[in-house]
């Protein structure tokens, strides 16, 4: 069935998914399974930050330009519980989590773990918001590429129970001994979808703002004790942020979070919504986004009701851009698109018709051009300005979705779709 109007990843939960996993295991011929290195001139480091230790604190993965390039690569999915959470999200038995762990548990992403920050420069900051069923580590291809071009990227792990899994510490003593409290994805009844998704997107926006405040506090020299005992000195971040150059980026539910965050927090100068799922947003936000906003969509995820809501963000006095990546699917923005070979990736809808590296490259370059323009960066990202306009053989300017049919419009905006 397909009820993506109220669930952007419903297609992953069909009973066929179990068969697909079995095929995945049987084939196990992954082919190209590497998360790509950043294309920019900077080496990239990675660390995690949790402050404070409670579920009301901030938890994020930080990608940043690093001083050296000789550290161990970063473990992509760092705890077994994340695999259990993914199996719950996919609607499979928790044992499937162990199989996923077997397949992906030792996979790394090309960032130097706990490498020192490259000093001597103030970096623009991007706060990144993950999609439903994801968590802070699953968009490393985007985070690493941005960091390789001179950004500090804070990939938030949301505690609104939209992540497959996340953890916190009940108290200080639990934090000291590393006794994690795990929080798993919340499955909603249909009658809860509207109000809970809206509450979640509001909390997510607050978590993005809180992450920004924390990093700006550290930048100002406020001593912050990371609840995670890691060999990265947060004091390195003092005076490292270009405090006027801050953006928010997110995928799917994270795309809605971008819009909610922009409407609430003017410190974010612009936003990029990657294949945004608009359903969680309340009607009041559309007219309250003064900052420039860029929609980068996949070809096969979007549908009329969603595009109509994106268009509601438009007004003559506001900077709005939209492009669609030809042959792309919803999962082209997340790392799982790189975790399997072509055939299996296609079967699982992790890959589209377009090569995954080409798709993420287009998205990243268009994003960099947009960020340069609206954060006032003195870089060479304007070489990709044409991508913002959709001027490329693999791009569609605007959208491929027809929203002029009133019948479709009304049918899809009701919020209740029948199972197909």
């Amino acid at each position: 069935f397909d009820w993506q109007y109220i669930n952007p990843v419903a297609h992953m939960k069909s009973s066929a998914w179990v068969n697909k996993i079995q095929v995945l295991m049987a084939a196990a011929s992954f082919g190209q399974t590497k998360i790509p290195r950043g294309n920019g001139p900077y080496s990239v480091g990675c660390t995690d930050l949790m402050f404070d230790h409670t579920n009301k604190g901030t938890f994020l993965r930080l990608y940043y330009p690093s001083q050296d390039n000789d550290r161990l690569d970063t473990l992509w999915i760092p705890n077994k519980e994340y695999f259990w959470g993914l199996s719950k999200f996919l609607g499979t038995h928790w044992l499937m989590g162990n199989i996923l762990r077997l397949l992906f548990g030792s996979m790394t992403t090309p960032a130097n773990w706990n490498s020192p920050l490259r000093p001597g420069e103030k970096y623009p900051l991007v706060v990144f918001s993950h999609g439903l069923g994801a968590f802070r580590t699953l968009y490393s291809a985007i985070g690493i590429d941005l960091a390789s071009h001179g950004f500090i990227v804070a990939a938030v792990e949301h505690r609104d129970r939209s992540a497959s899994a996340t953890y916190y510490f009940k108290d200080q003593s639990a934090a000291e001994i590393g006794d994690k409290s795990w929080l798993y994805l919340r499955t909603l009844k249909q009658e809860e979808e509207t109000h809970i998704r809206n509450e979640q997107v509001r909390q997510r926006a607050k978590e993005c703002s809180q992450a920004l405040s924390l990093i700006l506090d550290i930048d100002h020299g406020k001593p912050v004790k990371n609840a995670l005992d890691l060999k990265f000195d947060m004091e390195q971040l003092k005076d490292s942020i270009d405090r006027e150059k801050i953006a928010v980026i997110g995928h799917s539910f994270g795309g809605a979070t971008v819009i909610q965050t922009l409407s609430e927090d003017q410190r974010f100068r612009c936003g990029i919504a990657l294949d945004a799922w608009m359903f969680p947003l309340g009607d009041e936000v559309y007219s309250r986004i003064p900052q420039p906003l860029f929609f980068i969509n996949s070809e096969y995820f979007q549908y009329p009701a969603n595009i109509i809501k994106m268009k509601k963000c438009y007004s003559p006095d506001k900077e709005r851009k939209m492009i669609t990546i030809r042959g792309s699917v919803h999962q082209n923005f997340a790392d799982f698109t790189f975790a399997t070979g072509k055939i299996i990736g296609h079967m699982l809808k992790l890959k589209g018709d377009i090569d995954s590296n080409v798709a993420i490259d287009l998205s990243n370059k268009a994003s960099l051009a947009f960020l340069q323009k609206h954060l006032g960066l003195h870089k060479d990202f304007d070489q990709w300005d044409c991508l913002i306009e959709g001027d490329d053989e693999n791009l569609i300017p605007g959208t491929n979705i027809n929203t002029t049919n009133q019948h479709i419009m009304l049918q899809n905006s009701s919020g209740i779709e029948k199972y197909n």
Epitope: N55, D160, R161, S181, E199, Q200, R202, K206
Partner: antibody, heavy 121, light 107 residues
Amino acid sequence: EVKLEESGPELKKPGETVKISCKASGYTFTDYSVHWVKQAPGKGLKWMGWINTDTGEPTFADDFKGRFAFSLETSTSTAYLQINNLKNEDTATYFCARGDNYLYYYTMDYWGQGISVTVSS
Amino acid sequence: DIVLTQTHKFMSTSVGDRVNITCKASQDVNTAVAWYQQKPGQSPKLLIKWASTRHTGVPDRFTGSGSGTDYIFTISSVQAEDLALYYCQQHYSTPWTFGGGTKLEIK
């Protein structure tokens, strides 16, 4: 339909203990928190605190630390408020209300009918 | 703790009138303001959350607005059944706090 049903009125003497209940129905009990609110006769509303129905962890407002306890019976979807060493100023109507365990800006959307507790010697 | 002040303890109105009830917070509560209606002998009923979002089933004559520290609850055309106590509440940070209440009366 979401419902919170509270137990009947209580008449107690100073120094005694009262335990009042709030039975929830119409939703998944362990997804939503239970809050307690006090309303003294002719007065406004005062938030006492809440209990996380997933973990059982209670949180109290400063004025309600010490003599007050929140507890759960998850099997029957029931939350309890216990007040020890009752004082005259505990005379009030006590409301339970639904919040959310992890959405920490989620306000109290459904309320019980209220339980009148009278403390008099 | 965040203090909420409802300046008017009582407000007189007539059926069909438009009425505004104000609520001022001692600090920015980021639109996390709810409005409740309480009739005599009943429990409070949520009308508005997040300053302007109507709760399920609430008639559209009830609206809310505001941001920062200043919030307004409006009944566009008062009905006889709207005579009640109205409380604002902040759901931004614990301890959650309520305003003192505004009693709506018929002239």
